[in-house]
Interface confidence: low
């Protein structure tokens, strides 16, 4: 059988080889498609509801005014010429529809190195047969399940048109120290051969390198945080990170309304200054980090101060400052 591909919605003419160019003709078309149960026979006389789907032209060819998915199948013509010689034509018809240009939706504008990130979802609508979606990085194909690449695919079929919608969600784990501005694109490859791939516009998310979290140290002077009334306590927040982050101060879990500073001086200590203090370092490229908490207390004359201030965990981990 001769393979024929026809675009959905367009006309198709199949020639009946060996048929006389004009009537009277002795020919018969047999169809086995999605519209028929087993074989359907069409003759030049035609007539009836089938004329809107397929009819025999005066020259013996079969004419389909608008090919649909149901027209996929086998078409056979048997013709006898004026000398009584019989000729058979045999066609296998497959239909296709090229979708609109695929698009990347929900695309990320920024990715974080070293952790899985959703890059975006590639969507192709209106294809037949379904075809496939594939992702590219800097023009080279990305292989799922390799080097931190994973792809989630979904195929849906329109209940009325029978056309396919494909979705492909790309997740990647960018390497630390890699390309800060990778180029991703997605392409649709048709299910039928000889049709070129359709490619999306590229996206170029920025890859950010997270700054490694380093311990925030809180140093209290005098050591232990116990001081006589009217004394001075100096709290110093030490962060190894560069450039220096913003330092805010907390007392009893509440932000103190002070400008950012790595040093907090409590002069002329009074009862109102007693409590649990901690500092919060906010670096430009990651969330806030809180230090351990230290307890500041007043020693009444004659009292022995603790050798070390009571120290508690922050209990907050990360927090959003008011």
């Amino acid at each position: 059988a001769q393979n024929i591909t026809a675009r959905i919605g367009e006309p198709l003419v199949l020639k009946c080889k060996g048929a006389p160019k004009k009537p009277p003709q002795r020919l018969e078309w047999k169809l086995n498609t999605g519209r028929t149960e087993a074989w359907k026979v069409l003759s030049p006389q035609g007539g009836g509801p089938w004329d809107s789907v397929a009819r025999v032209l005066p020259n013996g060819s079969l004419f389909l005014p608008a090919v649909g998915i149901q027209d996929e199948g086998i078409f056979r013509c048997q013709a006898m010429n004026r000398n009584g010689k019989e000729t058979k034509s045999n066609y296998r018809v497959r239909v296709y529809q090229i979708p609109g240009k695929p698009e990347i939706v929900d695309s990320a504008s920024e990715l974080t190195a070293g952790v899985p990130n959703k890059v975006g979802t590639c969507v192709s609508e209106g294809s037949y047969p379904a075809g496939t979606l594939s992702w590219h990085l800097d023009g080279k194909p990305l292989v799922p399940n390799e080097k931190g690449v994973s792809v989630k695919e979904q195929t849906r079929r329109h209940p009325e048109t029978g056309l396919f919608t494909l979705q492909s969600e790309l997740m990647v784990t960018p390497a630390r120290g890699g390309d800060p501005r990778p180029t991703f694109s997605c392409s649709f490859s048709p299910g039928l051969p000889r049709h070129r791939a359709l490619r999306t516009a590229p996206i170029q998310p920025r890859v950010w390198e997270p700054v490694p979290l380093e311990e925030v140290q809180l140093v209290v002077e005098p050591e232990g945080g116990a001081v006589a009334p009217g004394g001075t306590v100096t709290l110093t927040c030490e962060v190894p990170a560069q450039p220096s982050p913003q330092i805010h101060w907390m007392k009893d879990g509440v932000p103190l309304p002070l400008p950012p500073s790595p040093v907090l001086i409590l002069p002329e200590i009074g009862p109102q200054d007693q409590g649990t203090y901690s500092c919060v370092a906010t670096h430009s490229s990651h969330g806030p980090q809180e230090s351990r908490a230290v307890s500041i207390s007043i020693i009444e004359p004659g009292e022995e101060g603790p050798t070390a201030g009571s120290v508690g965990g922050s209990g907050l981990g990360t927090l959003a400052l008011a």
């Epitope: 990320a108 504008s109 920024e110 501005r181 920025r206």
Partner: antibody
Amino acid sequence: EVKLVESGGGLVKPGGSLKLSCAASGFAFSSYDMSWVRQTPEKRLEWVATISSGGSYTSYPDSVQGRFTISRDNARNTLYLQMSSLRSEDTALYYCASSQLPPYAMDYWGQGTSVTVSS
Amino acid sequence: DIVMTQSQKFMSTSVGDRVSITCKASQNVGTAVAWYQQKPGQSPKLLIYSASNRYTGVPDRFTGSGSGTDFTLTISNMQSEDLADYFCQQYSSYPLLTFGAGTKLELK
């Protein structure tokens, strides 16, 4: 037509605060990294702050770290620069600029807003 | 920090001249260099990015070259409207950016 319009500049005393705004129009603001760049009275250009397109990441030079905060509101197409503990050396013309080109040159600049820190 | 040095603060030129403005980086920045033009009373305008790529709408008399540490902006046929300040900028360490001090083109 791409437009970046800065506002909020003025005269402020040392130690004071000021908030600059930059209203963007004519381009996909939420896809662009945005920066503040200042030009000193001696005409030198100095980078002040950068914020990523989604607003998750910010970066500053040591000279303003801890005193200046860059932020953005993508719904309002607006970029901000909160400046506190201002010093005389912060006196400059402040420009907002966008970076869309993949290599991160600054392709669009506003007309600038003047900040003078003086007692 | 990467320092960008424009050794010539001023350059005297005439209409029709070929002018070369140089910029030196304190360390290798690859081709992550941009050039900007600033006319009096105006904001800077991007001319060249990635060391040699001309930005949209920039006349082809402007050419950028160089890589590593040495970069040049060349104006092949100087016009009076090209009288301006020219700044180089590196973004190899993006988002940490640095500019050169600028070179002012003046008429002889």
